[in-house]
Interface confidence: medium
């Protein structure tokens, strides 16, 4: 008897075991969240584990499918969207991938009503893009490059553009570079917020220099993939405005809004586009060089059936340290007088914080302020502003909400997520139904992750939406490794960094020692997130350390961190993976002998050089799909961090960043070099360009590359590539397989 | 151009009543909290009394809880302030605000003035 518990506390610690490479690589310990689709105050609709499409009232609590999932079967559907006025739901499949964000699909109307698919004026396919109006059922699509319009889903079309040519002229949609650079989305068309008018762009790509690869198939000859891509000082596309009247789009047709004055005198992107109301649009450009961003606020003219933006309502934003914003501009988000707004800027500080804006960005009220940031603007409603932001004890990676009460005196702060699950979540985003009457909560970490539901009124919590709670059960009787998030102090800088640390984890021994690098500019790589990925595996079954480090040009820490890569790339944010790795050394647990360093895209970059500094400090490295050049990257982001590749700007810069430039510096390391040849972001070329140069300096060194595959490595490349890179790191670090 | 007109100060004895208004103007009126703040020869400029948009929430500093009452009709663009029991310290010049923002007053009336004395 007395004996049992010590038996079963044995035959629990026999029962544990390590996280291994299979695990990851079939996903086993992936967890789920729930974000609602919001279709009321107080009403969402979500798909259920059976794909029938179910809608749920909160103040009822009933819930009743709208769409059962053998109609979603009839068509093979993976995705729905119901128009505002509920009688029809649009079921989208045969979804074809194209870039980031970007796919075609072939689009069903399905007639709520009468429990049929909609016959006559079928959509043609595939189609680019396809969205409701807000209010009511019309329909915006985007085919073959032209924007169409249907007045209700059996209409016949009309057809907005013409001019829409493949890699020529894209209306609706972006271009390569603004998908990916700019707008971050696979649209460039929005609704007024009563479906009155449809606002849209125009990007004219004729005279962009294209980048051609070859995609290789199972075709005798392989084909070639030519995609209109502006590298560094390139010619960039040449975008316009366009905005129609919907109810009687023939009456006048598309009306182009006009460019502030200021940013039209020389080359100039648009970074975004925000309805105010029906009649009201604020639109957002940029100079190429973005350190001046002019937000223009724009009314409808009915005598003239125009648009005319006075220069009294353009609000300038300029940087005097760096670029505008901080990976891209932030949006405004209005308030209910239609002319007032509030937005995210840095103080005079330099901390990106709430501002609201009346009449001039000069007499800005700031409204949060601290050396912490504000990172994005919820919801705003009559009475209250939501927020998030890394306030909360003082940690820079993690995500709390806010709540500032305007409606009542005097105006108070609220934290509404920092003592909820304390241990568990520190790192939230939140979803708002109309006028913020109910949210949901979605905690990524660090602990597993939760979403809940909470009233917007008393921020009380309604239910657990999902908890993942099979995932939990998974993991008792997995070793999992230990992960811990401090700061080190280095000459006036603070470098975060999270440890991953072996689960029996021991001071006294020493251990080899993996890097995991971003280092991008405005990224963040230490947050209080959960994961059970390649890097708990390696700690959790191979016994290394893994680190990763916050430097120079990372966010979310004031300007004079971020801003700090400025027009200098590729030589702070190495700098500082070096120092960390050293103090790291001084901890007295890692084997100096035994130390390697690994990234993928702008990581793969900052490896490379960090094993090419001459240091002597890396064993080995890894880089995946690495950036070698910024004169091989597009312009929009390069330009942004790096000014123009021309003499009179930083093309001394451009030439000296390099990986070719430091070939000779691999002798001494062993470097792994891997890249998809169909990689349409950051192209092969710039592994091309770095073996090419490691073969001149005759420095031996390792290569894979996957064929016909992307910037993202997918399907069963991913398989090969982690098994090929444990392989690689066991064999540097000297790990039996 | 926002408009802001006080009326109804001035002379009264020490325990007496006064009621001020303020018609507001030029502004949409609805979306802004109201306020009346006081000005004593050689002092600073006192909040009083806050009232919300909707006029569901109020404010008053201890100095006058309980004696002022603060009130608006959003119909007529009228805010009001009830002053009870006044005392010889209340001499102020009163002026009625409108914020710009939240709590912010941007904006302010010329000011009435009201004189406590026996």
């Known amino acids: 008897i007395v004996l049992r518990p010590s038996r079963v506390h044995n035959s629990e610690e026999n029962t544990m075991r390590a996280l291994t490479l299979k695990d990851i690589l079939n996903g086993t310990f992936s967890y789920k969240t729930f974000f609602p689709n919001w279709i009321s105050g107080q009403e969402y609709l979500h798909q259920s584990a059976d794909n029938n499409i179910v809608l749920y009232n909160i103040e009822t609590g009933q819930s009743y499918t709208i769409l059962s999932n053998r109609t979603m079967k009839s068509v093979n559907a993976s995705n729905y969207g119901l128009s505002p006025d509920r009688q029809f739901v649009y079921l989208e499949s045969d979804y074809s991938k194209l870039w980031r964000y970007s796919y075609t699909a072939t689009y069903y109307i399905y007639d709520l009503s009468n429990g049929e698919f909609v016959r006559g004026n079928e959509l043609p396919r595939p189609i680019q893009y396809l969205c409701w109006s807000p209010v009511g059922s019309k329909l915006a699509y985007v085919y073959q490059n032209n924007i169409y319009l249907k007045q209700r889903p059996g209409d016949p079309p009309f057809q907005i553009t013409f001019n829409g040519r493949e890699n020529k002229i894209f209306n609706g949609i972006p271009d390569w570079v603004y998908e990916e650079e700019m707008l971050a989305t696979k649209y460039a068309l929005w609704w007024s917020p009563n479906g009155k008018f449809l606002a849209y762009a125009e990007f004219n790509d004729t005279d962009i220099p294209v980048i051609a690869y070859s995609y290789y198939g199972d075709e005798q000859y392989p084909r070639t993939i030519n995609i209109p891509y502006p590298k560094a000082g390139a010619k960039n596309p040449v975008v316009r405005i366009f905005i129609i009247d919907t109810t009687y789009p023939a009456y006048v047709g598309p009306q182009e809004v006009p460019v502030p004055a200021m940013i039209a005198s020389s080359d100039y992107y648009f970074s975004w586009l925000t309805w105010v109301t029906d009649e009201r649009v604020c639109l957002q450009w940029l100079k190429r060089v973005q350190n001046v961003s002019v937000l223009s606020i724009c009314d409808f003219r009915e005598d003239w059936q125009t648009w005319d933006c006075p220069k009294t309502q353009e609000h300038i934003e300029e940087s005097r340290t760096g670029w505008a914003g901080g990976f891209f501009v932030s949006t405004p988000v209005f308030s209910y007088d239609a002319i007032s707004y509030y937005k995210i800027f840095s103080d005079k500080d330099g901390y990106k914080h709430i501002h609201y804006i009346k009449d001039t960005v000069e007499n800005a009220i700031q409204i949060t302020s601290g050396k912490w940031e504000a990172i994005n603007i919820f919801r705003v409603t009559q009475d209250s502003l939501f927020y998030s932001s890394n306030e909360f004890e003082e940690y820079p990676g993690r995500r709390n909400i806010y709540r500032i009460s305007i409606g009542s005196y005097p105006p108070s702060k609220k934290c509404v997520t920092c003592h909820l699950r304390k241990e568990r979540c520190q790192y939230y985003t939140a979803s708002f139904s109309d006028y913020a009457k109910y949210y949901a909560l979605v905690c990524y970490g660090p602990g597993i992750p939760i979403s809940t539901l909470h009233d917007g009124r008393t921020d009380q919590e309604i239910k657990i939406l999902e908890e993942n709670k099979e995932l939990e059960n998974a993991l008792k009787n997995i070793q999992l490794p230990k992960e811990e998030i401090k700061k080190l102090e280095v000459d006036e800088i603070t470098l975060w960094y999270k440890m991953i640390l072996p689960p029996q984890f021991d001071r006294s021994k020493k251990y080899p020692l993996l890097i995991q690098v971003y280092g991008g500019p405005c990224s963040q790589s230490v947050r209080s997130v959960f994961a059970v990925n390649w890097i708990s595996y390696l700690a959790s079954k191979e016994g290394m350390v893994i680190a990763l480090v916050d430097g120079r040009g990372t966010a979310f820490q004031g300007d004079k961190l971020l801003y700090a890569v400025y027009r200098k790339l590729g030589v702070y944010e190495v700098e500082d993976q070096i120092t960390a790795v050293r103090k790291f050394i001084e901890m007295g647990f890692i084997d100096e002998k035994r130390i390697a360093i690994w990234g993928w895209s702008y990581g793969g970059y900052v490896s490379s050089l960090a094993l090419a500094s001459g240091t002597g400090l890396f064993k080995c490295g890894i880089a995946v799909a690495p950036v070698s050049s910024w004169e091989y990257y597009a312009s929009v982001y390069t330009e942004r961090f790096m000014g123009l590749p021309t003499k009179d700007d930083n093309l001394e810069h451009y030439k000296n960043s390099t990986v070719m430039a430091r070939a000779e510096y691999f002798r001494n390391v062993d470097y792994l070099l891997i890249h998809g040849t169909a990689d349409d972001n950051v192209h092969f070329q710039n592994s091309a360009q770095i073996a090419k140069a490691l073969v001149n300096a005759q420095v031996d060194f390792q290569a894979m590359w996957y064929s016909d595959q992307n910037h993202g490595l997918s399907g069963l490349s991913t398989n090969h590539l982690y098994t090929h890179m444990t392989h690689f790191l066991k064999q540097c670090f000297s790990l039996s397989d | 151009e926002v408009q802001l007109v006080e009326s109804g100060g001035g002379l009264v004895q020490p325990g007496g009543s006064l009621r001020l208004s303020c018609a507001a103007s030029g502004f949409i009126y609805g979306y802004n909290h109201m306020g009346w703040f006081r000005q004593a020869p050689g002092k600073g400029r006192e909040l009083v009394a806050a009232?919300?948009?909707?006029?569901?929430?109020?404010y008053y500093p201890d100095s006058v809880e309980g004696r002022f009452t603060i009130s608006r009709d959003n119909a007529k663009r009228m805010v009001y302030l009830q002053m009870n029991s006044l005392r010889a310290e209340d001499t102020a010049v009163y002026y009625c605000?409108?914020?710009?923002?939240?709590?912010?007053?941007?904006?302010w009336g010329q000011g009435t003035q009201v004189t406590v004395s026996s």
């Open positions: 605000a409108a914020a710009e923002f939240q709590w912010h007053f941007g904006y």
């Open positions: 009232i919300s948009r909707t006029g569901g929430s109020t």
